[in-house]
């Protein structure tokens, strides 16, 4: 039975050219996290964090995705095209798969504030 919940940074905004932390947190379960996959809006792969092997950053993002903090990702040099949904998929044992969603809005405005609040989607 899956008892856990995924908490995410929810809806966040950040400045064009800046960086943002994409973070998910699995709580309320003792399940072991074996792997976390990070995907972009079109379900294309950003990165994999395997418990045994560490990080695999998808080649197209190597120059602007930094692993961490923790199981999260830091997306740098943001462009307007980065606006959209991001998904964290937690593969766990014995529970199975948990999935969280984050919506990132990249703003042109120089006064854009980076809002990053933890919430359950």
């Amino acid at each position: 039975m899956m008892t856990g919940t995924i908490e995410t940074t929810g809806n966040i905004s950040a400045k064009k050219g800046g960086s943002v932390i994409l973070q998910c947190h699995l709580s309320s379960t003792m399940a072991q996290v074996t792997q976390v996959n990070w995907e972009q809006h079109d379900h294309s792969l950003l990165a994999i964090r395997n418990a045994e092997l560490g990080w695999h950053i998808y080649p197209a993002f190597k120059d602007r995705v930094a692993p961490g903090p923790g199981l999260g990702l830091t997306l740098q040099s943001l462009t307007m095209n980065d606006t959209g949904e991001y998904f964290c998929t937690y593969h766990t044992y014995p529970d199975g798969t948990y999935r969280g969603r984050i919506f990132l809005e990249v703003l042109e405005s120089s006064v854009a504030e980076h809002s990053a609040r933890f919430q359950i989607p």
Epitope: L45, E52, L53, G54, K62, H91
Partner: antibody
């Protein structure tokens, strides 16, 4: 002991297709990418594409799109590559190699020789 | 595509010598380079990953160096069993690309 066991040599007719296999032994199949590489004398090595059995992510070299199709069966820890519309240019040795992050293509299979001839 | 150039197609050396094989990338690939050895009739064997890290079980006479666009595989105290082809791979970006190879001949 980590092994990638590839299927045997193939002699095939032009215009037909061929499907070769790569069985992973000695490690967790779903943790690593499986890369496919073509080696032809005088042409060196060419990367065809890779597949991640732990999420079914697949990437192809543009040059091999429409030529190669990569699949994987996690129940048997086996990756497959099908080559279609074969010509003499497809005659080569095809290798599978596992990879992940920094460990790009660290272990290779013994290769499958494909000869296209009428 | 990133082009990996190994300008020396053949290199001749003697047992006990030191030899350096080079590989040049057409653009910055940081340290995402692997060096391989392939003996006749065999599949490639990884020697060095991330430009300078020896793979498990590789003798310490094999050393890798470089970053960015210029990479070197150095074999010190060459042994007769080192007769082989050596080639580099970049895995910084798709499509992954290989150097053309350098055949090491023992005098």
């Amino acid at each position: 002991q980590i092994q990638l066991q590839q299927s045997g040599a193939e002699l095939v007719r032009p215009g037909t297709s061929v499907k070769m296999s790569c069985k992973a032994v000695g490690y967790t199949f779903t943790n690593y990418w499986i890369n496919w590489v073509k080696q032809r004398p005088g042409h060196g090595f060419e990367w065809i594409g890779d597949i991640y059995p732990g999420g079914y992510y697949i990437n192809y070299n543009e040059k091999f799109k429409g030529k190669a199709t990569l699949t994987a069966d996690t129940s048997s820890s086996t990756a497959y590559m099908q080559l279609s519309s074969l010509t003499s240019e497809d005659s080569a040795i095809y290798y599978c190699a596992r990879g992940y992050g920094s460990y790009a293509m660290d272990y290779w299979g013994q290769g499958t020789s494909v000869t296209v001839s009428s | 595509d990133i082009v990996m150039t190994q300008s020396q197609k053949f290199m001749s050396t003697s047992v006990g010598d030191r030899v350096s094989i080079t590989c040049k990338a057409s653009q910055n690939v940081r340290t995402d380079v692997v060096w391989y050895q392939q003996k006749p009739g065999q599949s490639p064997k990884a020697l060095i990953f991330l430009a300078s890290n020896r793979h498990t079980g590789v003798p310490d006479r094999f050393t890798g160096s470089g970053s960015g666009t210029d990479f070197t595989l150095t074999i010190s105290n060459v042994q007769s069993e080192d007769l082989a082809d050596y080639f580099c791979l970049q895995h910084w970006n798709y499509p992954y690309t290989f150097g053309g190879g350098t055949k090491l001949e023992i005098k």
